[in-house]
Every structure is written in structure tokens, then in C-alpha cells.
């Protein structure tokens, strides 16, 4: 078959077998199927631990696996044409033996998004690390392989065989050897539980052929859900050893007679079963059948029991174990619900805080409230967020869009706004003229003045600084003062030669702080528009409109 059974673990109502062999997923499934099983399911953390145990057993016996990262097929597959579904725990994969989707998964990494190819899952084992119950094998998905080409690092597979029930291992009261043969053709001398329909061959004696006795038993269903071997009394008993060998094969107490014979007995609260070896509790709760925090509750007349879970938990399909109830499925919260063991908690999205009517309600955080505004200038609260805006002559700046920075209108994207010299100020700008020119009433153009070789007319005195001045008219010359360390204009403007023919020299003499002669308060020329920044609103230039790059819509503040 290309695969050898190297290990077997039986627990509950299932047996897991691990096999080494470089087979494709289909060949591995076929191998399991021939013996009445399927590639193994891993539907819970507990089942993952059983599978890990059988793999550990295999690896102890396996001399040298070829890859450090070894993969073993399990029964999780996605058929050709079935797409990856990120919304499901099994991502659109399903168990080959059928059965419902379960919430447990242990994916190794983000899955490859595909639909065309059939995809198969293997358990990924790092053989350089010890196998620990806390470090369960991860699920790795990939192509399913083909005969002779199983896929990278495939070293074997795990099968699962399910049974109606299990028998306890046979107990020997003296020297001997038990060999179990399971329905799935595995032979073993050490099983924690032996599956229904298994045969047990018991050879008593210490190897001396003359003294060897053989017994043959079958694990049968004696009554509904009661499985035993049909043997009575301990096997291979020997007067030579009495109770000293393996406690006489007794489950609890062993009582010796004077002639070397012995009997099995039970402790108070227990009774001896028909096999005359095993003890069972008179009180069904005394064996602690309930797990995971479940409480055992006796039924009428102390005959049977039920398990009961604490609040926030419910019984799983075995009716023995408690699993957390996912209260979040009922959407009890206004925004985010976090399921917790035995309960849940409500959380609010960024930009919201707990509050408002009803349990788990959330209300908007007013980031613009007094004393908490993150914005340098204007702040507008929005539902779940906020955005900042800036006053005229400033634009939003800073990585998070909360700061305001002066717009240098003198170097705006539409070119200089002044006919000749341009002086940027905090939040505004003003125009000036070269020597021999005077500022026109519109505060932008320069007209030929009385011949003078004095300094250029410059920025206004402090008290004259006010609203932005200027409108778009044909430009003759541009000048932009170089910037001081704090973004304020230096005294010396940079100038470019006027395009109008002029003999007036270009000066670099210190400026006198002169107001533009006859400058008006605000000039608007609605018919002429200044080109604003891309996607910004189109406003007439000059006046109190945003002339250069300002877009007062603001940007959303980042939380």
C-alpha cells in the first residue's frame, strides 16, 4: 500500500492511526477507507491532542523522516470549484467523512485564495521542536498531490475509525501477553481502550511453551452502550504470584485465599461487574463523568445522571462537557461585542464611548469639546470622528491634519498674486512696487510714478495688516521676499525684472515699511477667477476668499 501503520491511539469512541509514507491525499484516504475509516478529523482541541499523541508515537518509532517540517494528511478538503470562504472557520473546507462544520480551526497562515484546484489540508509538524500539548500541529493547505507526487514535505497521514463503543483492556493476573487485533487490522498489545469487535488473544505463561495457555476473547456489546469481553475473573492467574502480580489483574481490591487463589473486590460505593474484575460506582456521579466545569446531577433513584453547566455555558454534543455560549450571536451590543468565557462585553468603536439609552449603547465622543480639541484652529465634530479646518490664509498641515500652516500666497500654485513685489504675512499677503513705480488703487498693479530712485514701496505697518488684498490682473513683475527663520518676511525682497520696459534699477536696499499708496480695503473682480489648488473650490481671487491652496473643507482628523 505504500504506508505502514506505526501507531494507534484509542480514546472515547474512536481510534486514530498514524502512518508514514509519501502518498497523495487521495491515496491516503483510500488507505484509511479500505479499513473502514477516513482521514482523521480534528474538530476540537481535545481531538487535536489525540491526533498529536498518535503522531508522537509514530515519530518515536520512525527512524528518519526526510523533512524537518513534515506534513501528515488529515481529512479536511475543498473540492474543485468550491471557493475559499473567509467568513467560515473551515474557510469553505469540509471533512471527508461528512459531519457538520465545527468552530475549531488551527490554520498555519493565511490561505491561498483559489477555487479551481482541489485543496487538501495536512498537519504541519516541526520535527526540530518537541510535541507539546500546548503547541498543537498547525493546519497547512495545499495541492492534494497525485500518485508518485504527493506534494512537498508530505511524510504520512492520520486515519480515524469510529466505533459504537470500547472495551476496557484485559487485565492479567499473572505472566502473559495480550495481543489485540482491531477491526481496522491493527495489532497492538497496549491500548487504553479497545474498540468494539476487536479480538484479544491472551497467551499465559512466561514463555515456556509447555506452560503456555491461550485464551481468545471478542469485545461485544453486552447491553446498550455496555461493552465487555465476556470473560470472568482475572486471566493468567498463578498461585505463585497471587495478588502480587499486577494486583491480580483486579481493578480495585485483590483478596488472596490461603491456597494461593484470590478474588477481586471493590471499595465502598462501588460494585463488582460481571467480569469479576472491574468495579463500577454505585453512584454514577462518583466517577466524575462531567467535564469542563459541568456539575453532575443524580437522576431519580440514583440510577443515572445529567450534567449541568454554569451560567454562560452550555452542554456540548457529548452532553458531558460545557462549552462557552457565544452571547454575541444575539447581537446584544450597539457596536462591538466581545465574547468572553461565560459571558460577553460590549465595546465601542473608535470615536465613540459607552453611554446613551439601553444596555451596551455607545455615544459619539465630541472631540471638539472645550479643552479637548485636537485642532490648532477650527474643529468640527462628526459622528464617530471630527475634522479640522483653518482660518483664511492658512492650510491644514501635520501628519494627522490637525495643524494649520500659513499659506505663502506669494508662491501660490497660480503664480505670484502681485504685479511686482509680494510680501507674505501670517494669514495674508501684501503687494509692493519697485522704485519708480507706485501701487495702483487695486492694491496689486504697479503704475509708473514720479521718477524716484528711492526704495521700493513695501509692506504696510502693523496696524494696516488686515484682509488679503489683490485681484488677478495681467502681471508685470513678481517678487517674493525670502523667508525668515520663523516664516516671517525678511527685510530684503527677491525681485524679478519687470516685463514692462523700464530703466528703473532693481534694488536690494533695505525696505522702508510703507503702506501701499491708496490701497483699497477689499477688491473683488468676480468675472476673473484665480486657479486654486486641484479639487479646491473655485473662488474669486483677492478679498477674503481663499486665493491659493486653501480648501476650508478640512481633512478628517485621525483618531
Amino acid at each position: 500500500t505504500g504506508a505502514d501503520t506505526e501507531a494507534v491511539v484509542c480514546v472515547g469512541t474512536a481510534c486514530y492511526t498514524a502512518h508514514s509514507g509519501k502518498l497523495s491525499a487521495a491515496e491516503a484516504q483510500n488507505h484509511c477507507n479500505q479499513n473502514g475509516g477516513n482521514l482523521a478529523t480534528v474538530k476540537s482541541k481535545e481531538e487535536a491532542q489525540h491526533v498529536q499523541r498518535v503522531l508522537a508515537q509514530l515519530l518515536r518509532r520512525e527512524a528518519a523522516l526526510t523533512a524537518r517540517m513534515s506534513k501528515f494528511w488529515i481529512g479536511l478538503q475543498r473540492e474543485k470549484g468550491k471557493c475559499l470562504d473567509p467568513s467560515l472557520p473551515l474557510k469553505g473546507f469540509s471533512w471527508v467523512g461528512g459531519g457538520e462544520d465545527t468552530p475549531y480551526s488551527n490554520w498555519h497562515k493565511e490561505l491561498r485564495n483559489s477555487c479551481i484546484s482541489k485543496r487538501c489540508v495536512s498537519l504541519l509538524l516541526d520535527l526540530s521542536q518537541p510535541l507539546l500539548p500546548s503547541r498543537l500541529p498547525k493546519w497547512s493547505e495545499g495541492p492534494c498531490g497525485s500518485p508518485g507526487s504527493p506534494g512537498s514535505n508530505i511524510e504520512g497521514f492520520v486515519c480515524k475509525f469510529s466505533f459504537k463503543g470500547m472495551c476496557r483492556p484485559l487485565a492479567l493476573g499473572g505472566p502473559g501477553q495480550v495481543t489485540y487485533t482491531t477491526p481496522f487490522q491493527t495489532t497492538s498489545s497496549s491500548l487504553e481502550a479497545v474498540p468494539f469487535a476487536s479480538a484479544a488473544n491472551v497467551a499465559c505463561g512466561e514463555g515456556d511453551k509447555d506452560e503456555t495457555q491461550s485464551h481468545y476473547f471478542l469485545c461485544k456489546e453486552k447491553a446498550p452502550d455496555v461493552f465487555d469481553w465476556g470473560s470472568s475473573g482475572p486471566l493468567c492467574v498463578s498461585p505463585k504470584y497471587g495478588c502480587n502480580f499486577n494486583n491480580g489483574g483486579c481493578h480495585q481490591d485483590c483478596f488472596e485465599g490461603g491456597d494461593g487463589s484470590f478474588l477481586c473486590g471493590c471499595r465502598p460505593g462501588f460494585r463488582l461487574l460481571d467480569d469479576l474484575v472491574t468495579c463500577a460506582s454505585r453512584n454514577p456521579c462518583s466517577s466524575s463523568p462531567c467535564r469542563g466545569g459541568a456539575t453532575c446531577v443524580l437522576g431519580p433513584h440514583g440510577k443515572n445522571y445529567t450534567c449541568r453547566c454554569p451560567q454562560g455555558y452550555q452542554l456540548d454534543s457529548s452532553q458531558l462537557d460545557c462549552v462557552d455560549v457565544d452571547e454575541c450571536q444575539d447581537s446584544p451590543c450597539a457596536q462591538e461585542c466581545v465574547n468572553t468565557p461565560g459571558g460577553f462585553r460590549c465595546e465601542c468603536w473608535v470615536g465613540y464611548e459607552p453611554g446613551g439609552p439601553g444596555e451596551g449603547a455607545c455615544q459619539d465622543v465630541d472631540e471638539c469639546a472645550l479643552g479637548r480639541s485636537p485642532c490648532a484652529q477650527g474643529c468640527t465634530n462628526t459622528d464617530g470622528s471630527f475634522h479640522c479646518s483653518c482660518e483664511e490664509g492658512y492650510v491644514l498641515a501635520g501628519e494627522d491634519g490637525t495643524q494649520c500652516q500659513d499659506v505663502d500666497e506669494c508662491v501660490g500654485p497660480g503664480g505670484p498674486l502681485c504685479d511686482s513685489l509680494c510680501f507674505n504675512t501670517q494669514g495674508s499677503f501684501h503687494c509692493g512696487c519697485l522704485p519708480g513705480w507706485v501701487l495702483a488703487p487695486n492694491g496689486v498693479s504697479c503704475t509708473m510714478g514720479p521718477v524716484s530712485l528711492g526704495p521700493p514701496s513695501g509692506p504696510p505697518d502693523e496696524e494696516d495688516k488686515g484682509e488679503k488684498e489683490g485681484s488677478t490682473v495681467p502681471r508685470a513683475a513678481t517678487a517674493s521676499p525670502t523667508r525668515g527663520p520663523e516664516g516671517t518676511p525678511k527685510a530684503t525682497p527677491t525681485t524679478s525684472r519687470p516685463s514692462l520696459s523700464s530703466d528703473a534699477p532693481i534694488t536690494s536696499a533695505p525696505l522702508k515699511m510703507l503702506a501701499p499708496s491708496g490701497s483699497p480695503g477689499v477688491w473683488r473682480e468676480p468675472s476673473i477667477h484665480h486657479a486654486t489648488a486641484a479639487s479646491g473650490p473655485q473662488e474669486p481671487a483677492g478679498g477674503d476668499s481663499s486665493v491659493a491652496t486653501q480648501n476650508n473643507d478640512g481633512t478628517d482628523g485621525q483618531k
Epitope: D85, S87, I116, S117
Partner: antibody, heavy 120, light 108 residues
Amino acid sequence: QVQLVQSGAEMVKPGASVKISCKASGYTFTDYEMHWVRQTPVYGLEWIGGIDPETGDTAYNQNFKGRVTMTRDTSISTAYMELSRLTSDDTAVYYCTNYGNLYYYAMDYWGQGTLVTVSS
Amino acid sequence: EIVMTQSPATLSVSPGERATLSCRASSSVSSSYLHWYQQKSGASPRLWIYSTSNLAFGIPARFSGSGSGTEYTLTISSLQSEDFAAYYCQQYSGYPLTFGGGTKVEIK
């Protein structure tokens, strides 16, 4: 960014075959399936089939079965679609497309299209 | 195969008006597997809405999608000049993937 660049327009005779290429860039070629869709004025958009570049597995529309072959060359990140026994009904714009990081066959990326004209 | 039928074939709408495009499947389709594409003349189709109601990257919020089972709808709340184009629905519930015949949205 993801780019799909297709080979140029083709003029072929009835009964002949055509092989169109689609060169992918901006992602790992074997990560995403490649699909082929054609568009005609009569039939509109028709899915021809797809290939999984990792395995070479294909899925074809039954309407084209036996006439279409999809292949790939992972070394040059290129997918190919060959259509044989052409008739005038196969005159169409042929697109290669894939769904990138989206799920459920939502075709996020498209080639520029290759016009195939079947005429004698 | 599942046949996708779009109606109307042509929709004449004025800019600023609301437009509703319908897509009907011949048998039930999972809402996760129902998508819409926009195509302008001479260009390749472009994914517009995926999984019934999710807008593809960069698609304006005036577009929305809804539906389940066999009936799906694409709605444009206020048509802009750039929205005039052909829209196709597409489904997958096993091969082959199929597209609707398209609805051409034109200026009234």
C-alpha cells in the same frame, strides 16, 4: 500594482486556431487564478474558463470544451488561452482577468483585451 | 447553468436622477457570489460592486447594491455624467460563471 498585459489583435481564418497570451506583473503569478472572458455584441460577456497557475489545473465552460486549452509558463508569469476550430461567431474581444485578493470570483483585475477577428 | 437576466436593457435617465438596475437569476445565488461591473465604450469591464453590496475600491458612495436569492439590484442615488455606461451582473454557484446581458445607462 497588479497589471495584466495581453498580446495584440489577431486576424484568423475560419477553422484555424488562435493563442492569446496574458503577462502578469505586480504580484506572485502562482498566487492568483487566471480566467478568460470574451465579449461579443450578440452573446455579451462569456466566461471561457480559468487556470490555477500553481497546479496547472483548469476549469472550462462546457460551451467551449474540446476547443479551448489553457496553459501557463510560471517562469515568465504568463498565461495562455488557445481556441481552435474558429468560426465567425468567435469574433470577439478576449480578456484575461483575475480576482486578486478579493473572494467569491469578483474579478478585480482585467487585461486590456485582445480583438480576435475570424474572417476568410 | 444559471442564466442572469438584466432589465431594462437600456435606461434613459437625466443627471441628478435616481437609477435602479435589476438582475434576476434563473435559480438562487449566494449573495457573496453576486457582483456588478461597469464598462465604458472601448474599455475593459471594471469591478464596481462585489458580494451584492460592497463597493469596490474608489467607487463613489452614490452607488449601492442589494438583494438575495434570485433578485439583485444596483442603485445610483443621483446620476453624475461619469456614471453613464453599461453595467453587468455576474454570479458564481458552480461552473460556469455567468454574466447578465447588461444594462446601458444613457443620458435622457
